[in-house]
């Protein structure tokens, strides 16, 4: 059990107050983290509270401002980037969001040597992506879907690609589906370690069907947003990878990197690129049917001026029980010999673990093992490998950082974080300086988050970077709910759950229950992290019990649980939520006449199916921006888990797993359906089809749309949304306003 430390003494009870919805909407109890912007083994940059950019040297203890807030303010800069030679800084302003990761901005180059902005050959605007070379001060940027190179900030640009066209050809940046579902970045270009070469992806969306929706704005006529968006089974983007020599780019021009023959024989994806050395690069490819991934190591042949990817350097990763990898196929972390690497993939027992690959995947040496999972490899040095896992005390929802000494034999393992602040900190990430000389640990909970700096050799804590003192003080008079993380064992399935209980929780009383669900493949909701959010308020002020349950299809507990949903989304995720609710009722403190479920996105799909399950368990529920049919969602994501919507593949389950097919079953529940009309991700179409099916079935329901809002329902819509959902739940649970 993880209980929030109670600060309530009887004498103080009248000074304590419950959380309010206003607290949540105002972000009163938000926390800060500190991620150093490392620029060497012992130096980092950080933007101070007053917006100066400060350079810290850990070894000398000195710090100095490299860029004043005055300079930042002069161009309204909201972000910055120091060139590796420390001569220039780019300043980013006019941030304009596009999709989840992508945005455009205006960039100014500031010359630190003379304290002036670089004049002449200024950058065009708006730029879609810009980055420094890893050495020196070359610049690569993407403007109007084409890539440009500057040898020095004041130099004129060299145009590398010329075929870029809006919504047609994307160079150096991903199209919608690659950004959201494959790369999870705003960029698709990669400098080699010393800046000799620049690799980039070209995405051709010419033949992709377009999703079109109205953006109402303020004009007399709405405008139409058009996005090439491949839904399940549709034509996909065609990807090519090129590499150009940045020293003399006008000579050879970009060289295309060959696709492995076994991949190129049918539809495929490019999944990631990792530079090993300036003349060796590693590309990862994936078949459209995403159970086969190929890692290809390519070498530059100076005499031919070409990239050679020998078959002997192709490593195949295949899943026979599900899809390849977890959410994404893992990326390799190369060792110092520049050919062998460490990679996370399933072991013979079906748990994701670190393996060391020297020649073939078949001969891989397993580095970690157990009925838990290695989650991320942070850094490999000459003698150590740093990774995170959920091994400690067998809680899947924790993250601790481990060090394996790979320089000694046999390798020894040490948990760096397990006992640092055991009650407060059970969920960590880390950020390492060059050669792992130093590292920052960022603890996300379950207590108040804290960021600390450590010596990479001894693991000794050097200093606290951020401990959220103000937050701690602000929470002193707040009655926070209690949280517990436990598990249910049902039919050989372990269902971990997090329960959020009202501050004065009494097991002998009956409470309304709200299930918050996400439940998507390879997700995890039950995590030992700190949060003061809407459900905290519902428990603290409105006296609800909130539960989150990780059922089949969720991550970090082995392939049996993860791949259980393969090719049949919408079945077991829903079953497991229902099973958990039944178990919660058996615990005796749940009012079984007041049970609700809510979720967003995939969670909206699961909550809708749970409400329409015909069990009579749920009185009401909310679906925010739900998927309603897998035929409406993106190919890359959907097909990974469902295969293709064709007769000879999995069309039958595509049809059986829609929300619309269960319209009749909503008759006996109160359903609130919510969606943004400008949702580029889960299109409004999904909710439009649910609404149509419910109307056709003559089923009453409630709905709310948010005009011109995307999948995140941000800004004022957030306030409206949570206020609206609160009213709905209070009404459902007969709670007075």
């Amino acid at each position: 059990i993880v209980l929030r430390p109670s600060r309530v003494h009887n004498s103080e009870e009248n000074t304590m107050r419950a959380l309010t919805l206003k607290d949540i909407l105002n972000g009163t109890f938000s926390y800060k983290t500190f991620f150093p912007n490392w620029i060497s083994g012992q130096e980092y940059l950080h933007q101070s509270a007053d917006n100066n950019i400060v350079l810290y040297n850990i070894e000398t203890g000195q710090s100095y401002t490299i860029l004043s807030n005055r300079t930042m303010k002069s161009v309204n800069a909201s972000n910055y980037g120091l060139s590796p030679d420390r001569q220039f800084v780019y300043l980013e302003s006019d941030y304009s969001k596009l999709w989840r990761y992508s945005y455009t901005a205006t960039y100014y180059i500031y010359d630190l040597s003379n304290g002036e902005f670089v004049r002449g050959n200024e950058l065009p605007r708006p730029i879609q992506y810009l980055c420094w070379s890893p050495v020196g001060s070359k610049l690569a940027y993407v403007y109007q879907n084409n890539i440009y190179l500057k040898q020095r900030p004041g130099d004129p640009p060299f145009q590398i690609t010329f075929n870029g066209r809006e919504n047609k050809i994307f160079n150096g940046i991903p199209d919608w589906v690659y950004e959201e579902e494959m790369l999870a970045t705003k960029y698709a270009l990669w400098w080699s370690p010393n800046g000799k070469f620049l690799a980039y992806a070209e995405f051709n969306d010419t033949d992709i069907p377009v999703i079109a929706y109205s953006y109402y704005g303020d004009e007399q006529y709405p405008r139409t947003i058009n996005i090439p968006y491949p839904k399940a089974g549709a034509k996909n983007p065609v990807v090519r990878i090129f590499i150009i020599d940045t020293t003399y780019p006008a000579y050879v021009g970009p060289q295309e990197v060959p696709v492995p023959a076994m991949i190129a024989s049918s539809d495929y994806y490019f999944s990631w690129l990792t530079w090993v050395t300036d003349e060796r690069v590693c590309l990862q490819w994936l078949k459209r049917v995403q159970n086969v991934s190929v890692l290809s190591i390519c070498d530059f042949r100076e005499d031919w001026q070409t990239w050679d990817c020998p078959k002997t350097q192709e490593h195949i990763e295949e899943s026979r029980t599900g899809w390849a990898g977890g959410f994404f196929v893992s990326t390799p972390v190369f060792s110092y010999d520049a050919i062998s690497y460490y990679k996370i993939f399933s072991d013979k027992d079906g748990y994701k673990h670190i393996h060391y690959i020297k020649d073939t995947v078949e001969n891989a040496i397993q580095i970690t093992s157990g009925k838990w999972e290695a989650i991320n490899i942070f850094r490999v040095t000459q003698d150590s490998l740093f990774y995170s896992s959920n091994e400690f005390e067998e809680y899947p929802g924790r993250r601790n950082i481990y060090r394996i000494s790979i320089g000694s034999y046999p390798p020894s393992k040490k948990c760096v974080t397990c006992h640092l602040r055991k009650e407060r900190c059970q969920y960590y990430t880390a950020s390492f300086s060059d050669y792992a000389k130093y590292y920052a640990l960022v603890c996300y909970g379950p207590g108040i988050p804290i960021s600390t700096l450590h010596d990479g050799r001894t693991d000794q804590e050097i200093k606290i970077l951020e401990e959220n003192k103000e937050l701690e003080n602000a929470l002193k008079n707040i009655q926070l709910p209690k949280e517990e993380i436990k598990k249910l064992e049902v039919d050989e399935i372990t269902l971990w759950y997090k329960m959020i209980l009202p501050p004065q929780f009494d097991r002998s009383k009956k409470y309304p229950l709200l299930i918050q669900v996400y439940g998507g493949p390879c997700s995890q909701s039950v995590r030992s992290v700190f949060a003061v959010n809407w459900i905290s308020y519902l428990a603290s002020k409105e006296g609800m019990v909130i539960a989150l349950v990780d059922g089949r299809g969720t991550a970090f507990q082995g392939d049996k649980l993860l791949y259980a949903v393969y090719r049949k989304l919408g079945v077991y995720e829903v079953e497991d939520q229902i099973t958990a609710v039944r178990k919660f009722i058996e615990m005796g403190f749940i009012d079984e006449k007041r049970i609700a479920i809510w979720g967003w996105s995939y969670g909206g799909y699961v909550s809708s199916l749970a409400l329409a399950s015909g069990t009579g368990l749920f009185k009401c529920g909310i679906a925010v921006a739900p998927v309603s049919s897998w035929e409406y969602y993106a190919s890359v994501y959907t097909e990974r888990f469902m295969g293709l919507p064709t007769k000879d593949d999995n069309l039958e389950h595509y049809k059986n797993s829609t929300v619309m097919a269960r319209a009749e079953y909503f008759r006996n529940v109160d359903y609130l359906l919510i969606h943004g009309t400008a949702d580029d991700n889960v299109h409004f179409q999904n909710s439009a089809q649910i609404a149509k099916a419910l109307v056709n079935a003559q089923v009453d329901f409630q709905a709310m749309w948010y005009s011109d809002q995307n999948h995140g329902l941000s800004g004022l819509s957030t306030n409206h949304l949570y206020t609206h959902m609160t009213h709905f739940l209070k009404q459902c649970f007969s709670l007075s306003d």
Epitope: F158, A250, Y251, D303
Partner: antibody, heavy 116, light 108 residues
Amino acid sequence: EVQLLESGGGLVQPGGSLRLSCAASGFTFSSHAMSWVRQAPGKGLEWVSAIWASGEQYYADSVKGRFTISRDNSKNTLYLQMNSLRAEDTAVYYCAKGWLGNFDYWGQGTLVTVSS
Amino acid sequence: EIVLTQSPGTLSLSPGERATLSCRASQSVSRSYLAWYQQKPGQAPRLLIIGASTRATGIPDRFSGSGSGTDFTLTISRLEPEDFAVYYCQQGQVIPPTFGQGTKVEIK
């Protein structure tokens, strides 16, 4: 030893067509960008067209829509299909190794004369 | 397009003398994209200098290049009889790549 050998030049009437070839040897042709550069009699050099190893084509405005550059990597040969020829296209046509600059190897050239 | 203007049009010098050829661009050219070529009558051009100052393979060290921005120079420190030819500068910064009109180095 790198060698580039042009052929296909000759006398052609205005409006006529001609196809130039450039046979390459001594290097991995399939992995190099190639260009055509011309030189009118007694004049300077003028870049005409280029093609990446992967096939993307680039043209000078003066020939766009009339000339087509192509390559056959299996034959190690570069081509320039010239249509709607004009008197001002009269020149020695060189094939050169390179995209937009650093043309490190050139053929001996082939003369194209456009005249009625 | 970028216009490259070479001067002088003709340079009359004796063997053993120093030749200084100028190339001026109508707009800024990054050093990486500036090359020099030599052409003798009835022959194809030959690459001399890349990146404004780096000698191409097999080019003797009496040839040197310098300059940046809009002004570039090719210097032949001591003219040899075989150096009498036409010299072209060329930019590959933007499409179309362009050549200067040439400087003829002739025997005085």
